[in-house]
Structure formats: structure tokens, C-alpha cells
């Protein structure tokens, strides 16, 4: 808002731009025929000090000479770095009442020299891309600092460019604009950056490089590949780059993986065959070039080639497993169940399971295909039995696997001893046993299988099971085991043509049963009384139930009362007691126990026995 | 059609200064390189400066390193080459050119890579 310096004029010595720590003299001088009017003596000349439009410091007190009425010279000291305005204002003394009128102003600046700038780097992108560098300018000049890039190079040549730094943009970067080609890979070229403000200039030291330092291929472009013979491991991935390429590098690696399986090729050309690939998965493919063997930069990485390679038929073989169940003199059913094939071994998606029965001495031969993991037939009792699967894909089936069906616990001799099933953690159980005491032939293998101990389990969930070597006696069981649930739990020892099992109850993790038995009836009979009860709804026993406890006493006794506890067996629902008078009401009650401890007590049933007492 | 006018051009005393114009008509040259090139009698034509407009940047031979300087008017699609600190060996018919991209470093220097071309305007730095 300074009217143009009409009043007159402010100068600065030594100049207006300064080093910071240095001092000032700003003066401030009126034109002829200036000032108050009557009292040219009256005339006060004010310095105001702005720092951001903001008055920050009224100088009167720096006045270092005065010519009163006509000029004052004020002296600046600790001014900080950027820009101070200083404006000069007259005062006219005997007139309190007006403002002091402004004289004129001047702007300060404060910085520093520039530092030589360092860390010259220059980069061009692609063969056919432009020279640019960068640099580190140092500190801040608070200036306006200008910068000359500055590249000689063959044929007598010198490129240069200028950009300038101040409080709005830095400068720290140029892009020449020129192509530097691959006819000057020998050639050397040096570049310098100088800058000058102000206070003082200052040059980098010269940076030497060739045309190989700094070209960055770019990243190769249009991959793709091609499976020979619709083959699943091998391929040949294709991609396009620069000319001058001599060197690539190949990354892929399978989607789900953390690691890449690394390649180098040498003028490959845009044409790589790959040996190893797993077939029917699906992989991503990167490339990365460079301009030289030894020297030079490599490229940033393609973008990704995504894609699935093809399938290849099945390997490995399905582990098989079967449940026996007869159903009249002369029919049984048997049901067999596969675990699916793993995806290395699977290969591709499986479309069916090929299973086969078949009677071994009169050639009797039962075929289907699923595409479930559980087949069931009815079948004769007689004859000698074995089954096989094989799973197919598009391009052809596994290896049939056979197992021979026998009476999976129908040999006592073969039933493996002292089973016992600890809780390890929340979600597995460890199953061990020792060996079969006086087994006639040799165990094959231990088969440990489990199911969930719920109603209809059997015909709604297929088994769980583990392959066991015969030298094994432990198992760890986690697949589908869950806490506070009890399972059923089998140990097979299968030789060639039998089979013995034995079998126990395990849980992962117990606590207290929710709630006891509802005792449903007590029967007088033969002078013994029967308690009948319902089991505890699956979700409440919150565990294996070791035993059911019977309690009892008489009606308004404060007595404790007896007891009887019942190994606990699902197949059981009444228990005889034979201790109670007769003539004397007494009232029932059932509990549960699992390892983690009691339930509360079930309903209570008050009865009178009506017979002799024992 | 593409014109190239150059003027400025006369006699001058040896550390004399002289300034160049180059007027260019016809079409934009926003991404041409434009120079100027001489030939002194007898001698084979020689680069001597180029602007490159896209890019702001300057190319100069090592003989007029730091006594020349180029620089232009995108309005009135102008170049000018200002000769400071002149000699006797700068005496040559100095020819205004504009050539279209790619910019390579090895064709900027290279008359053959031009494809416009002035009439030419006459400096002598003589005492």
C-alpha cells in the first residue's frame, strides 16, 4: 500500500540483498518541498519493521543519523533469513491527532550463498528417451538461486539449462530434452551444475559417465506364454524389448507364493524356455532388461503376465478308507470315502473318481464313476473283496488305488492295546496304543479314524481318518476337531487280509456338562428300582461324559445324600438301584461328569418304593 | 511454405558485439530445434548454437562456449544469437536451420539432420 514513493525515497547500503548476521542501514530521505507543512523542523522520519505483513518493531531507537527534518539512517541488525519490509513513515509532531503518512519502502532479503550442489545423477529412460539430472542443491539459500545444468560431451558439443529455486519451487531437477543414441555407447560426456544467487556462486565437481551408465532400458513389454504341446511344466515365455537389450532377468513364482524362482538369460532375444512349472497353477511372470553385461542398469520389472498353466493327468494316489455294515444274512453295504488329491498331485480340476468292486474269485466286477469322495454299494456277504480308485482330470486318471476290503474288527488278536487319547490343545488330540499282543500275521498299517459322538453322525458325516505306518504308535489328530466335543475314536491294525480294532472316546478340550440327565421314569420291579433318563442334548455335555452320578435321599432329610455313579455308555439309558426303604418317599436326581468336572443336577423325581427292602 | 528470415548481421570490430535475429514463418516450430550454423569461405558449414524450443535447452560448440548466447521468442517465433567478445576466426555467413524431432546429441551438431534453412546474413569482424 506504498504510494509509489511520492514523499520521497529509502536506499539500503550495502545492498538490499544481505548475508544472514549481517547489518543494514536503511535511510529514508524526503523530496524537496516535502514534509510537515509550517515546521519543516517538526518532521519526524519512523522506520516500521513488517515480517509477513505484520508490524513487528518501531526502529526509532536505531537511528544512527539524522538530518532533521530532511533524512534519517536507521541501522538493521539480526535480521532473519527471507524477506523483511521495512517501511518509512513521517511523523508530523504537532499534529497528535493524524497518522504518520508514508515516505516509501524497501524490501530486505536475507540468505545465504549457495553450496556447491552434489550427488549429480543423470538417467535416460529407454533408448528412446531424453536425458534428465538430478541433484542435490544443499541448503536452503533463501534466495532466488538459479542453476545452470551444463552436459559436453562428443562432437564438440555443450547442452545447458537453467531453472531457478526460490520460497515457491525448488529446483532440483532437469530433463535436457535430447536422446543420447546408442552409436555414442563409447562416448563420454561430463556434466556440472553451477549455482549463483545473490550472494555468491558456486559449481559442482564435474561427473563423468558413458551413454551404458546412464540408459535405463525400459521395461519389457507384450509377454506372453506358450505351453508346448498344451504342456503343464513346460513353456516358452515371449516379450518384447528394446533393441540393445543383451541381458535379461526372469522372475516367477507360483500366486501363493513369498519367493521367486530367479533366471538369468543372456541374448535371449524375447524368447525364454521354461522346464520346472507346476502344472495347472496359476503363476505370474516379471522381466527385467539390461543394456550391457557388465555395466549399465537394470530396467524396473515388467508388468506381470498372469496366467494358469495347463493341466497334466493326476499323480500320486488317494487315500483310501471304507466303512462295513451289514444289513441281512446274506447283503452288506459298504461305503468307501477318498480324501481329495492335493493340488501338485491332482494336477488340474478333478472331473470324476473312477471306483471299482470287485469279487477276487469270481470276477465279479462292480464300476462307477462320482465326483463325490464317498461311493456306497450293496453288496453279497460272501467272497473276498477289494476296491480301487482313481481320480481324472482333462488330461487322464492316477494310478488306481487298491485296498482289500476285510472285517475291519473282526479279529480279536489284531485289536492294538492300552489306546488312550490325551487333549493336546484346543483343536487336536493325541491317540496312542501299543502293538496287537499275539497277532498271527504281520500289521500292514495302523488306520486311527474319529467321528463326532452326535446323533447321526454315522450316516451324515463321513469319517476322519490317518494312515499309520506300522511302526508307529501315536497319532496327532486335528482334522475337524473342535473343543468341547467328544469323539469316537478307533485305532485299526490291518494286515494283508484282517483286521482288529479298538476303540476309545476323546475330546480336544472339556468343561462341566451344561446340565445333568432328565430322569424320564422310576419302575419298581423284583424289589429293585429303575431310573430311565435322556441323554444330555449334544451341545450341553460340553465334552466326553466319563459317568452319569444317581443321587438320592429321603424328602425332607437334611442328610447328604448317597450316591451311585454309572460308567457312562450312550447305548444305556436305565440303571438299577437296590438300596431304598420301603414306604419312604424319597427324591432322585442325575448329574454328568467329564474330565473338567460335575453338572449341576437334572430334575428331581420324588417315589415311594412300595416292596420289601433289601 | 516454411520461411526462415535472418538479419543482424555486419561489420564489426574484433570483441564488438552483434545480435542475430531469425524469424521463422510457415508453421510453429514448438518442437523443432533451431540453430544457427556458419561458413566462412573456403571452410565447410559449422554448427555453432541450437535452442531446442520443447525443452528449453541450449546447445553450443566449445569454440562460442560462454561469448554466445541463443534464445527465443515463442511469440513471434524468433531466434536470436547474441555474440559477445567477437573475433576475426567468427568472420562467416551464418545460416539460420530448424529441423523436426527425435533430438538426438548426435544430429543437433550435424547440418545434414536440418531440414529448413535461411539465406544466410553476413558477419565480419574486422578491425
Known amino acids: 500500500n506504498i504510494d509509489v514513493c511520492k514523499l520521497g525515497t529509502v536506499t539500503v547500503q550495502p545492498a538490499p540483498v544481505i548475508p544472514l548476521g549481517s547489518a543494514a542501514n536503511i535511510s529514508c530521505s524526503l523530496n524537496p518541498k516535502q514534509g510537515c507543512s509550517h515546521y519543516p523542523s517538526s518532521n519526524e522520519l519512523i522506520l516500521l519493521k513488517f515480517v509477513n505483513d505484520v508490524l513487528v518493531e518501531n526502529l526509532h531507537g536505531k537511528k544512527v543519523h539524522d538530518h532533521t527534518g530532511h533524512s534519517s539512517t536507521f541501522q538493521v541488525t539480526n535480521l532473519s533469513l527471507g524477506m523483511t519490509l521495512f517501511v518509512c513513515k513521517l511523523n508530523c509532531s504537532n499534529s497528535q491527532k493524524k497518522p504518520p503518512v508514508p515516505v516509501c519502502g524497501v524490501e530486505i532479503s536475507v540468505g545465504v550463498a549457495p553450496e556447491p550442489p552434489q550427488n549429480i545423477s543423470c538417467v535416460q529412460e529407454g533408448e528412446n528417451g531424453t536425458v534428465a539430472c538430478s541433484w542435490n542443491s544443499g541448503k536452503v539459500t533463501y534466495l532466488k538461486t538459479n542453476y545452470t545444468l551444463q552436459l559436453s560431451g562428443p562432437n564438440n558439443l555443450t547442452c545447458q539449462k537453467q531453472c531457478f529455486s526460490d520460497n515457491r519451487q525448488n529446483c532440483n531437477r532437469l530433463d535436457l530434452g535430447i536422446n543420447l543414441s546408442p552409436d555414442l555407447a563409447e562416448s563420454r560426456f561430463i556434466v556440472r551444475v553451477t549455482a549463483i544467487n545473490d550472494l555468491g556462486n558456486s559449481s559442482s565437481l564435474p561427473h563423468t559417465f558413458t551413454f551404458l551408465d546412464i540408459v535405463i532400458p525400459l521395461p519389457p513389454w507384450d509377454i506372453r506364454i506358450n505351453f508346448l504341446n498344451a504342456s503343464g511344466s513346460r513353456g516358452t515365455l515371449q516379450w518384447e524389448d528394446e533393441g540393445q537389450v543383451v541381458l535379461n532377468q526372469l522372475r516367477y513364482q507360483p500366486l501363493n507364493s513369498t519367493s521367486w524362482n530367479m533366471v538369468n538369460a543372456t541374448n535371449a532375444k524375447g524368447k525364454y524356455d521354461l522346464r520346472d512349472l507346476r502344472p495347472f497353477t496359476e503363476y505370474e511372470f516379471q522381466i527385467s532388461s539390461k543394456l550391457h553385461l557388465s555395466g549399465g542398469s537394470w530396467s524396473n520389472w515388467s508388468e506381470s503376465l498372469r496366467t494358469r498353466t495347463p493341466e497334466e493327468e493326476p499323480v500320486g494316489i488317494l487315500d483310501i478308507w471304507y466303512m462295513k455294515q451289514d444289513i441281512d444274512y446274506d447283503r452288506q453295504q459298504i461305503s468307501l470315502f477318498w480324501k481329495s488329491l492335493n493340488p501338485s498331485e491332482a494336477r488340474g480340476k478333478i472331473l470324476h473318481y473312477q471306483v471299482t468292486l470287485q469279487e477276487v474269485t469270481k470276477k465279479t466286477t462292480l464300476q462307477n464313476t462320482t465326483r463325490h469322495t464317498s461311493w456306497t454299494r450293496v453288496i453279497p456277504r460272501t467272497g473276498a473283496w477289494t476296491a480301487s480308485v482313481s481320480a481324472a482330470n482333462s488330461k487322464g486318471a492316477s494310478a488306481p488305488t487298491h485296498i482289500n476290503i476285510v472285517d475291519l474288527c473282526g479279529t480279536g488278536l489284531l485289536a492294538p492295546h492300552q489306546v488312550s487319547a490325551k487333549s493336546e490343545n484346543m483343536d487336536n488330540i493325541l491317540v496312542t496304543w501299543q502293538p496287537p499282543k499275539k497277532a498271527d500275521s504281520a500289521v500292514r498299517e495302523y488306520i486311527v479314524e474319529w467321528r463326532a459322538l452326535q446323533p447321526g453322525s454315522i450316516t451324515k458325516f463321513p469319517p476322519h481318518w490317518l494312515r499309520i505306518p506300522p511302526d508307529n504308535m501315536s497319532a496327532l489328530i486335528s482334522e475337524n476337531i473342535k473343543p468341547y466335543i467328544c469323539y469316537e475314536i478307533r485305532v485299526h491294525a490291518l494286515s494283508e487280509s484282517q483286521g482288529g480294532c479298538s476303540s476309545i472316546r476323546g475330546d480336544s478340550k472339556h468343561k462341566a456338562p451344561v446340565s445333568g440327565p432328565h430322569i424320564t421314569a422310576i419302575t419298581e420291579k423284583k424289589e429293585r428300582l429303575f431310573i430311565s433318563w435322556t441323554h444330555i442334548p449334544f451341545p450341553e455335555q460340553r465334552g466326553c461324559i466319563l459317568h452319569y452320578r444317581i443321587y438320592w435321599k429321603e424328602r425332607d432329610s437334611t442328610a447328604q445324600p448317597e450316591l451311585c455313579e454309572i460308567q457312562y455308555r450312550r447305548s444305556q439309558n436305565s440303571h438299577p438301584i437296590s438300596s431304598l426303604q420301603p414306604r419312604v418317599t424319597y427324591v432322585l436326581w442325575m448329574t454328568a461328569v467329564t474330565a473338567a468336572g460335575e453338572s449341576p443336577q437334572g430334575n428331581e423325581r420324588e417315589f415311594c418304593p412300595q416292596g420289601k427292602a433289601n | 511454405q516454411v520461411q526462415l528470415q535472418e538479419s543482424g548481421g555486419g561489420l564489426v570490430q574484433p570483441g564488438g558485439s552483434l545480435r542475430l535475429s531469425c524469424a521463422a514463418s510457415?508453421?510453429?516450430?514448438?518442437?523443432?530445434?533451431m540453430g544457427w550454423f556458419r561458413q566462412a569461405p573456403g571452410k565447410e558449414r559449422e554448427f555453432v548454437a541450437a535452442?531446442?524450443?520443447?525443452?528449453?535447452?541450449?546447445f553450443y560448440t566449445d569454440s562460442v562456449k560462454g561469448r554466445f548466447s541463443i534464445s527465443g521468442d515463442g511469440a513471434k517465433n524468433t531466434v536470436y544469437l547474441q555474440m559477445n567478445s567477437l573475433k576475426a576466426e567468427d568472420t562467416a555467413v551464418y545460416y539460420c536451420?530448424?529441423?523436426?524431432?527425435?533430438?538426438?546429441?548426435?544430429?543437433?551438431?550435424?547440418?545434414?539432420?536440418?531440414?529448413?534453412w535461411g539465406q544466410g546474413t553476413q558477419v565480419t569482424v574486422s578491425s
Open positions: 535452442l531446442m524450443w520443447s525443452a528449453g535447452s541450449e
Open positions: 536451420a530448424a529441423k523436426n524431432p527425435p533430438h538426438r546429441w548426435s544430429d543437433i551438431g550435424k547440418s545434414p539432420h536440418y531440414e529448413y
Open positions: 510457415g508453421r510453429t516450430f514448438s518442437n523443432s530445434v
